[in-house]
Interface confidence: medium
């Protein structure tokens, strides 16, 4: 504990010398002297154990979720989940680590955010990166050829997010995948019909969905002159387009990437385009574009999906971007991308998109770097972005000042009287029984202001009163929270009574 | 800052040629896709052609297609309309507008006009 | 063809008015859609791009709002040099078109 002392005394002495000589404008060379000499003392003083104070707090890029915020979390996921099931999709879990080997290229340069766990028992595990490559690994497992699932739970990856706008490094994927051999198309156009329902239900403003296509990308940088050692760089900055201007987007390739000019220009000229169908027929009558196999193959299949779009009533959410090239190095066709459209104060702030809230694609070969065959299993599917949607929905709530319930309770069961807890006891479970959602406050002899304030607080419709007129009469209070307005109802009918009153169907079988 | 200067405009015989120009300046014009949109004297707009940036990919109106051919010379920072077998309809002020990625298809800069009158 | 109507094709307003334009596209276009402000004689000049995105340097005064087959341009507090026409163009498909145009004169 002396040495300590002694050694805390020479770090204060020597950081009075290194203050003295900066006062002074004592030469670099010995300032820089000097300062390491205190690190070192301050190293061999090391972390005191009893002044650490351990900051309480959530890893970074995580968060707790308040009930307020799973009340809305419950919300979405609900209409999410109801859209999955009425497209018929089945529903798996997988572990929330798999092997290493099993993420290990399959995410291209992503591949740096995976998170490794330290050596448990022998096997070199990582934490999922997304549920697309457990997905696949499922299929090839268990030897499946035809699917359609969905799966929702966590997925962690190792960046430094920007959570004020929905990005972290625990963060719900709610997906959505088709699996089999299928005409083409089609299951790519449910899948794009399914992006569209949930973000319409769920109200969170006017949206657009980019498409393009993993081959038309290809044969463009092809005819454009950009070699496959470029094309992931190259793609990254294409895909900023929606953010900056072309210029800027040409001077990152060229200065900062290395792109010859002329290459860059000739990219210009396709990525600075969108449109629908009629772009996709344009292209297809290109000089260029057309004679590229891959490009072609990719620019017909775009316009069979406009046709089903189209007969899906869609089509006008949909825009075909050149400038579409992010993604994943597993996708091999079509990709698509939704993003909010939002009203910003000055052009420059984000021209269009708040950022992507759901994304996907056909990924027709990963199920075969599994199989030690490589037998394929043709993949198309989505990914909702949850976590920026509840963002957004949690924002606009308060802005809107609208308060959340956060709990489903119906009813809640108060006395008007003391000592009438017994009798509350012998309702609520009555209730409970019955499959009514109720509640009491755990004391005695609550006031009913009390009762009832605490029902305007948590935003409980009903409350039942019992008194001992009532309990003489064989009958309980009703009353309306919001009303105010009360009946006498007979005990025997209270129950059917409360599930008219709250919509509940009559019978929970 | 941004400038667009139309030249070339006049009188036309039906049937007539006359080959636009657009100088532009303030910009790096081979980074931009360019147009040419009309107005016919008291009327609305109509999108006649577009061109992109380097290699020339062009679109045209309906009204115009066969007829009309748009060009450009990155090097002298020049777009052009040639304007063949005109028809009285096509009489018009012609103004050449440069426009963005992010909102493809908008003129967020546009020159002042010329005007072509085709009549016999 | 897309085709885009405007309505109505003439308003009269006094300085102070708030002032709404509206402009129908005869099929979905989500949010490409323009609005544009030209006086006699002059070029046209661009508001709004994306049906509500205010282009640099223009009075905040000019809103844009909606999408997909309905639009509207406002002006909240007409100014003197707010009398012109004005054009909405849609910029989902080629070739993109523009509404007739709606002339704002003064009461």
């Known amino acids: 504990m002396a040495e300590r002392a002694a050694l805390e005394e020479l770090v204060k002495l020597q950081g009075e010398r290194v203050r003295g000589l900066k006062q002074q404008k004592a030469s670099a060379e010995l300032i820089e002297e000097e300062v390491a000499k205190l690190l070192k003392l301050k190293a061999q003083l090391g972390p005191d154990e009893s002044k650490q104070k351990f900051v309480l707090k959530t890893p970074k890029g995580t968060r707790d979720y308040s009930p307020r915020q799973m009340a809305v979390r419950e919300k979405v996921f609900d209409v999410i989940i109801r859209c999955f099931k009425r497209h018929g999709a089945e529903v798996i879990d997988t572990p929330v680590f798999e092997l290493k080997e099993t993420l290990m290229g399959k995410y291209g340069e992503d591949s740096k955010l995976i998170y490794d766990l330290k050596d448990q028992g022998g096997e070199l595990l990582s934490l999922r990166y997304d549920l697309t490559v457990p997905f696949a690994r499922y299929l090839a497992m268990n030897k499946l050829t035809n699917i359609k699932r969905y799966h929702i739970a966590k997925v962690y990856r190792r960046d430094n997010p920007a959570m004020t706008r929905g990005r972290y490094r625990e963060f719900y994927q709610c997906d959505f995948d088709i699996a089999g051999n299928f005409d083409p198309m089609i299951p790519d156009a449910e899948c794009l019909k399914i992006m569209c329902e949930i973000l319409s239900s769920l109200q969170i403003g006017d949206f657009l969905v980019k498409v393009n296509d993993r081959r038309i990308l290809d044969g463009m940088f092809a005819i454009c002159g950009v070699s496959d050692s470029k094309f992931r760089t190259i793609c990254s900055s294409v895909d900023k387009l929606d953010k900056v201007s072309w210029e800027e987007v040409k001077n990152e390739m060229v200065g900062e990437k290395g792109l010859a000019p002329e290459v860059a220009d000739r990219i210009g000229d396709y990525v600075q385009q969108h449109g629908g169908v009629s772009l996709v027929e344009q292209l297809l009558q290109d000089p260029k574009l057309s004679q590229n196999k891959q490009a072609l193959e990719g620019l017909g299949d775009l316009k069979l999906l406009f046709e089903y779009l189209t007969l899906f009533g869609i089509d006008d959410k949909i825009s075909f971007d050149l400038s579409l090239a992010r993604g994943l190095d597993y996708y091999t066709g079509v990709i698509y991308e939704a993003v909010l459209l939002q009203t910003p104060a000055q052009a420059g702030e984000e021209p269009l998109g708040v950022g992507s809230v759901a994304a996907g694609g056909r990924y027709d070969g990963l199920v075969g770097m599994f199989d030690p065959k490589g037998r394929k299993v043709p993949c198309v599917g989505l990914s909702i972005g949850v976590e920026r949607i509840f963002s957004i929905v949690e924002q606009r709530l308060e802005a809107l000042e609208e308060k959340i319930r956060t709990t489903e309770t119906q009813v809640l069961v108060a006395s008007a009287q003391k000592k009438l807890l017994e009798e509350r006891l012998k309702l609520v479970s009555e209730l409970w029984d019955a499959g009514i959602k109720a509640e009491l406050l755990y004391k005695k002899n609550p006031k009913l202001l009390n009762q009832l304030q605490y029902c305007e607080e948590a935003g409980i419709p009903l409350v039942a009163i019992i008194g001992e007129q009532e309990l003489k009469d064989g009958v309980i209070k009703l009353r309306s929270v919001t009303s105010r307005e009360e009946v006498d109802v007979r005990r025997e009918d209270l129950v059917e009574e409360i599930k008219r009153r709250t919509g509940q169907p009559l019978c929970i079988c | 800052q941004v400038q667009l200067v139309e030249s070339g405009g006049g009188l036309v015989k039906p049937g007539g040629s006359l080959r636009l120009s657009c100088a532009a300046s303030?910009?790096?014009?081979?980074?931009?896709?360019m147009t040419w949109i009309r107005q016919a004297p008291g009327k609305g707009l109509e999108w006649v052609s577009y061109?992109?940036?380097?290699?020339?990919?062009?679109n045209y109106a309906d009204s115009v297609k066969g007829r009309f051919t748009i060009s450009r010379d990155n090097a002298k920072n020049s777009l052009y309309l040639q304007m063949n077998s005109l028809r009285d309809e096509d009489t018009a002020v012609y103004f050449c507008a440069r426009y963005v990625y992010q909102v493809v298809a908008i003129g967020d800069y546009w020159g002042q006009g010329t005007l072509v009158t085709v009549s016999s | 063809d897309i085709q885009m109507t405007q309505s109505p094709s003439s308003v009269s307003a006094s300085v102070g008015d708030r002032v709404t334009i509206t402009c129908r596209a005869s099929?979905?276009?989500?949010?490409?859609l323009a609005w544009y402000q030209q006086k006699p004689g002059r070029a046209p000049k661009l508001l709004i791009f994306?049906?509500?995105s205010l282009q640099s340097g223009v009075p905040s005064r000019f809103s844009g709002s909606g999408s997909g087959t309905h639009f509207t341009l406002t002006i909240s507090s007409l100014q003197p040099e707010d009398f012109a026409t004005y054009y909405c163009?849609?910029?989902?498909?080629?070739?993109?078109?523009f509404g007739q145009g709606t002339k704002l004169e003064i009461k």
């Open positions: 303030g910009f790096t014009f081979s980074d931009y896709y």
């Open positions: 994306a049906a509500s």
């Open positions: 061109i992109s940036g380097s290699f020339a990919y062009t």
């Open positions: 099929q979905g276009i989500s949010s490409w």
């Open positions: 163009q849609q910029a989902k498909s080629f070739p993109y078109t």
